[in-house]
Every structure is written in C-alpha cells, then in structure tokens.
C-alpha cells in the first residue's frame, strides 16, 4: 500500500521514513537474480560506505522487491545528504543510486482514531486521534475524509478536508449578537428552546473543520445520520517534507438527532434551576441528561459526563397539546449548559437527540404577566401591565393578542421594548378576549415566551356610553 503512495516518486530506489528516526528503502527488479545478488550501500559525507541488510519479496508477474530497513537509529540523520547506491555482487554494475535527505522523505503512519462522537451542537462531530509518533505530530498536517454511511448507497458523497490547526473549535456563538437586536424587538431567535422550523445554511454539505493537536471538530453534518471517517497525515512541508501517508482504518459514528425534532424547550425561572420539556413519543420512554462546560474550544482528551436530569410527572394540560416529558436540574451561571434526550422505543432501540448549548441567562422564562384594562371611550381601551421582573424591565418585550368572541383567529400586537402599557381600538358593542405574554430579549438576558395570561374578557360599551 505504501508503495502506491510513492507512485509519484520517479526514483527507481524509493525511500520513506515513518517517524524521521527510521528509514526504509526499496526497489524492484524484473530479472530473476539469486538471493544475495544485491547490496544496498549508503554513506553520509566523508564517511565510509556501509551495507544495509536486505530482505526480498517475490512479486507475482513482476520480479522481486528488495527492501532495506536501516538497522540503527543512529544511521538515520536529518539535514545531511545520504548517498545510496545498489551494487550487484555478481556483475560489475551499479543498479541505481540516489542522494536524499531523510527529512524530505516522510511517509507518516496513519493516525489511529481513538474516539469519534457527537459534538456539543447538533450536526457536530468531535474526533480525537493518537499519533503513532507523538514526537513529530507538531510537524504534520492532517486530512480527514468522511461521508454518510448509507448501506443502500455505498457511493455517497465523500468530503475530504484539510484540518486547520490554526484555530481551535469554534467558540460557542451567543445567539444574540448586535445584528439580532436590530430586528424587531421580539424577533424569534434561533435558540435551543425554540421549537419552530430549523434554520439551516443553504447547504448542509459544506461543513467546517477545526483542530487542535489530536482532536478536531466537524460541523455542518446532518443530525441523526451515520458517518464513516478516516484520517491521514503528511509532513508540513516547512520543517519536514514527504508525502501523504495512508488513510487510517475507517471509523463509523452515529450522530445524535437534533432535539428540535422533539420540540425541546429549556428555561429557568430563577437563574438557578433549569426545566427542560419535550414532546413525549408514542410507545417510547425518554430520559433527559445534562452537563456543564466552561470550555470555549475543543476539549482535548476530555469527554463529557452526562448527568441525569431529574424527571417530573408527565403533563397534559390540554387535549390539543401533545404530552410533554419534563425534567429539571440545578445549574450554574458560569458555564454552558448541554442537553441530551434519549428516547427508548419499544424494541429497546435508543435514539439520542442533542439540544443546542446555552447559557442560563439565555433561557430565562418570565412569569406570566398580569393584564389590566379600562375603557376610556367606546371601543378605546387603555392597557397596563406590571413588568414580571423589574430587574430586566428594559430587556422585556411583550406580545398582546386579541380575538372577537366566536372567532378563531388572533390578532397579535408587539408593543415597543420596555413599554408598560398601551392603547387599543376595538369595535364598540363587541366582546373580545385579550391575552398578554412576555419574554426577555436584551443584551444581558434572553429566553422563551412566558405562557399567555389567562384570557381577559372585554365587552366594549355602546358609542354613547362615554
């Protein structure tokens, strides 16, 4: 296999080094010579030639491959020209010769992938590997190839990407950047507790790679899919030179699904305890897990220990809404929260679903606000509400919805950020239901919508009443 990797090497005498502390040279002979016909001699400048012990391998339909592995590490020196020549013992001929630098003929052994598992975000994959020669790992660059493992389609798309060592894993993006605040104050963020449609980039095939030493994070994969992956390495071309080594044996990994599919929502009411809920699946049991991480980049050789999220009684508040599973745990405000839901189906198959990580201050759910009203004139209402959390008044936005009695459709209004009330024009002599909800959406705190307030029934007066 290694021979094919050296195919571009036009030299008849091919040499490679696995670790830059070893050297193997070989060449092929078509003619049927006796064993012991050839000597591979080598010499460094101003030194006496020495013979390298040869072994031979018969090659069907071709001839013989002669191989020499340099016997002594001390004979393998970097940055000095090494003169090699093949001498025929029986005939007066030098079969081939070349001068090389050991530091330019690297052919690294493939790294062994020791772990491949889902990363901290849906569609991420964390891999780590061991370098057979750790002392040279700083002088190697790595290439990863991977693709979906589809038994029906063995020729699925294969992605080959150079692993960039300059950066670590992408730091967790806080969902609310400045640009998010330029939108309407209550614009729906892409958050871990959102159960709306998943926002994806135009192409999920274009995936990103980053690495640090022996670990790497791939993103942009399809959650819930299986993938195979392989690694190989080559000298960096700066300190050491050579060729790409062979690919490692393929490793397969099943990525957890995206918990958005389960409608996962997590929130805190008190910045201490976190509650998560998700839709209960038919004929299946489920369990939530969590862990906290401080890491802003790839944890090297560190894999999370998932803790049990304490289960709550299943709720079914209304016949229209699906049944939810709920669990809760104590959290911290100095670390990122990761959520995993495991669904076990009746035959015992376990499916994992990963939520998008979040900080506790990104999942603050406000209590349901109280709505007060009075009719100023016929159909003209003045509305007022208390901020559920005075400490975050300027970061609280509201939605008011109302509907005429007997109607199904609701009209939704969004008062300005931080408003404590407003006015509403309704038809006189009509009956309405009004509801209010609140959520945090500022630079410090964010979170999901509170539940709607209990419907407030309003019957507007006739036009002569006021």
């Amino acid at each position: 296999q290694d021979v094919s990797l050296l195919a571009s090497d036009s030299e008849p005498l091919k040499c490679f080094s696995r670790t830059f502390e070893d050297l193997t040279c070989f060449w092929d002979e078509e003619e049927a010579a006796p064993s012991g016909t050839y000597q591979l001699l080598y010499a460094y400048p101003r030194e006496k030639p020495r013979a390298c012990p040869l072994s031979s391998q018969s090659m069907p339909h071709f001839g013989t491959r002669y191989v020499c592995q340099f016997p002594d590490q001390e004979e393998v020196r970097l940055f000095f020209p090494l003169h090699l020549w093949v001498k025929n013992v029986f005939l007066n001929q030098t079969r081939t010769q070349r001068v090389l630098f050991v530091d330019s003929v690297g052919l690294p052994a493939p790294p062994s992938i020791i772990k491949a598992m889902g990363g901290s975000q849906p569609g991420e994959l964390q891999i780590s590997w061991e370098e057979p020669a750790p002392e040279i790992s700083d002088f190697l660059r790595y290439e990863l190839r991977y693709g979906p493992r589809d038994p029906k389609n063995s020729t699925g798309p294969t992605v080959i990407q150079l692993i960039a060592t300059e950066t670590c894993c992408p730091a967790l993006q806080r969902p609310h950047s400045a640009s998010a605040l330029d939108q309407s104050p209550c614009a729906q963020p892409t958050m871990p507790w959102q159960d709306g449609p998943k926002q994806t980039s135009p192409s999920r095939e274009a995936s990103a790679l980053t690495a640090e030493g022996g670990s790497c994070l791939i993103s942009g994969l399809q959650p819930g899919n299986s993938y195979w992956l392989q690694l190989r390495s080559e000298p960096d071309g700066i300190s050491l030179g050579g060729s790409w080594g062979s690919w490692s044996l393929p490793v397969t990994v099943d990525l957890p699904g995206d918990a958005v599919a389960l409608g996962l929502q997590c929130f805190t009411l008190d910045l201490k305890n976190v509650t998560c809920q998700w839709q209960q699946q038919d004929h299946a049991s489920s369990q939530g897990f969590f862990y906290h991480s401080r890491a802003r980049c790839c944890p090297r050789d560190r894999y999370p220990i998932w803790e049990n999220c304490e289960e709550e009684e299943k709720t079914n508040p209304g016949l229209q809404t699906p049944q939810f599973s709920r669990c809760h745990f104590k959290s911290r405000n100095d670390s990122i929260i990761h959520i995993l839901v495991e669904v076990t189906t009746a035959p015992g198959t376990v499916h994992s679903y990963l939520g998008s990580p979040f900080w506790i201050h990104q999942a603050v759910r406000l209590p349901t606000p109280n709505l007060h009203w009075r009719e100023i004139s016929s159909g003209h209402l003045e509305l007022e509400w208390q901020h559920p959390s005075s400490w975050a008044a300027q970061e609280t936005c509201y939605q008011l919805r109302y509907t005429g009695e007997g109607h199904q459709d609701w009209k939704v209004l969004e008062p300005p950020l931080g408003a404590r009330g407003g006015t509403l024009e309704l038809r006189p002599r009509s009956r309405y239901r009004l509801q209010l909800r609140a959520r945090l959406n500022g630079p410090t705190y964010q979170g999901p919508w509170s539940s709607w307030s209990d419907p407030t029934r309003v019957e507007t007066a006739t036009e002569t009443a006021w």
């Epitope: 003619e31 049927a32 010579a33 006796p34 064993s35 012991g36 016909t37 018969s58 013989t64 013992v89 029986f90 005939l91 007066n92 001929q93």
Partner: antibody, heavy 118, light 106 residues
Framework: DVQLQESGPGLVKPSQSLSLTCTVT?????????WNWIRQFPGNKLEWMGY???????SYNPSLKSRNSITRDTSKNQFFLQLNSVTTEDTATYYC???????????WGQGTSVTVSS | DIQMTQSSSSFSVSLGDRVTITCMAS??????LAWYQQKPGNAPRLLIS???SLETGVPSRFSGSGSGKDYTLSITSLQTEDVGTYYC?????????FGGGTKLEI
C-alpha cells in the same frame, strides 16, 4: 569469444592439497562477471564449489567445510581452486565456468579429471 | 540447502517424440531455475534461464515452464542431437544446487 581452460594434476594423493587453474581468454576477469568452480562426480552428480567475483570477493559451498579456497592472479587473467585434505571422495571432473548476465553458467571449460588415490 | 529432484534418471525415447522432464525443488525458488544439457565427454551447456528464457542459439523445440517448486523442460519433437543428460539447477539460494540429471536414450 570467451574461453575457459582448466589445468592441474590428474592424480592427487589422499590428505594432500589439490590445486587447479582456470585460464580465461577473451575477457578480463576483473572487468565483470563471477567466476565459478563446479565438479562432477563419477556418478554424474554436479556440485557447485564456490566463486570469485570480478571485484575479488568469494563465496563457498558450506559442504566443503572450509577445505577450499578460490584466489586469482589478475595479471595472468587466471583464477584458482585449492582443495585441502582431499580424500577419494574428491575424485571428479572439475569445471570452471562463468556466471553470466542471467546468473547462470553460460560459459564452461572442457573440464579436467582428477583422481585421488594413493 | 535446497534439494533438487529429477524424478526420472533416464528415459527411453524415440525420435520425433514429445519429451517432458520434471524437476522439483524442496522449497520455492522463485523461477531461479536453469536447465543444462550435457553430452558424453563434454561440459554442460546452458539451455534455459529463469525457468522459461531460452538462451541464444538454443532450438525453439526446447521450452521451460513452472514456478514455485515445480518446473518442466519440454522438447516438442526429439532430434538425434538432443540425446544426452539434462540437469536442472537452482540459483535462488546459496549454495546453488543441481538435480541428479535425466538421461535421454534412443
């Protein structure tokens, strides 16, 4: 054309040494190739005894238990076989031959018959 | 040492016959096999190298085949001048060794 010619005593006493000469004409033994001694016993069995290469390195058949030695005289373009402590078992026809490009004996002398007897 | 065995020490043949002489090595010799012909009172003459390669000047009725441990010399239509003893020789591993010979007699 390359020619090889063996010469030496036809009769040798047991325990003595046997010395044979191979004279090569038409090619310099130091230029190239490997120069061999082979013997054929009365029952026609052939045995390779050893060689000397163009560069002067030698190799021997271990069955002769270090009794033989191959040397050369480059000025005369000759190479020699010396077999020590001979016994009647060493009675044979002795050939010199050249190992050619294909590592086979492509040129042979006509052979010299040696009898070991008291 | 590698032993070379020629199973038939002699053959009684007729002119025009197809003759096959076999040679077996005690281990794989990777086609490092030569065939020699020797006529009475003469030195051996090289016929074939590397199991199958015919030497210059050798009639095309001679051919060699085989690999691994088993090798064959074939003469398609025996001529009078082909009478003699045929030897195989391995040159894979030192010491180089010969077969016991196969004598062809009319």
């Amino acid at each position: 054309d390359v020619q090889l010619q063996e010469s030496g005593p036809g009769l040798v006493k047991p325990s003595q040494s046997l010395s044979l000469t191979c004279t090569v004409t038409g090619y310099s033994i130091t230029s190239d190739y490997t120069w061999n001694w082979i013997r054929q016993f009365p029952g026609n069995k052939l045995e390779w005894m050893g060689y000397i290469t163009y560069s002067g390195s030698t190799s021997y058949n271990p069955s002769l238990k270090s009794r033989n030695s191959i040397t050369r005289d480059t000025s005369k373009n000759q190479f020699f076989l010396q077999l020590n402590s001979v016994t009647t078992e060493d009675t044979a026809t002795y050939y010199c031959a050249r190992l050619g490009r294909r590592y086979t004996m492509d040129y042979w002398g006509q052979g010299t018959s040696v009898t070991v007897s008291s | 040492d590698i032993q070379m065995t020629q199973s038939s020490s002699s053959f009684s043949v007729s002119l025009g016959d197809r003759v096959t002489i076999t040679c077996m090595a005690s281990e794989d010799i990777y086609i490092r096999l030569a065939w020699y012909q020797q006529k009475p009172g003469n030195a051996p003459r090289l016929l074939i190298s590397a199991a199958t390669s015919l030497e210059t000047g050798v009639p095309s009725r001679f051919s060699g085949s085989g690999s691994g441990k088993d090798y064959t010399l074939s003469i398609t239509s025996l001529q009078t001048e082909d009478v003699g003893t045929y030897y195989c020789q391995q040159y894979w591993s030192s010491p180089w060794t010969f077969g016991g010979g196969t004598k062809l007699e009319i």
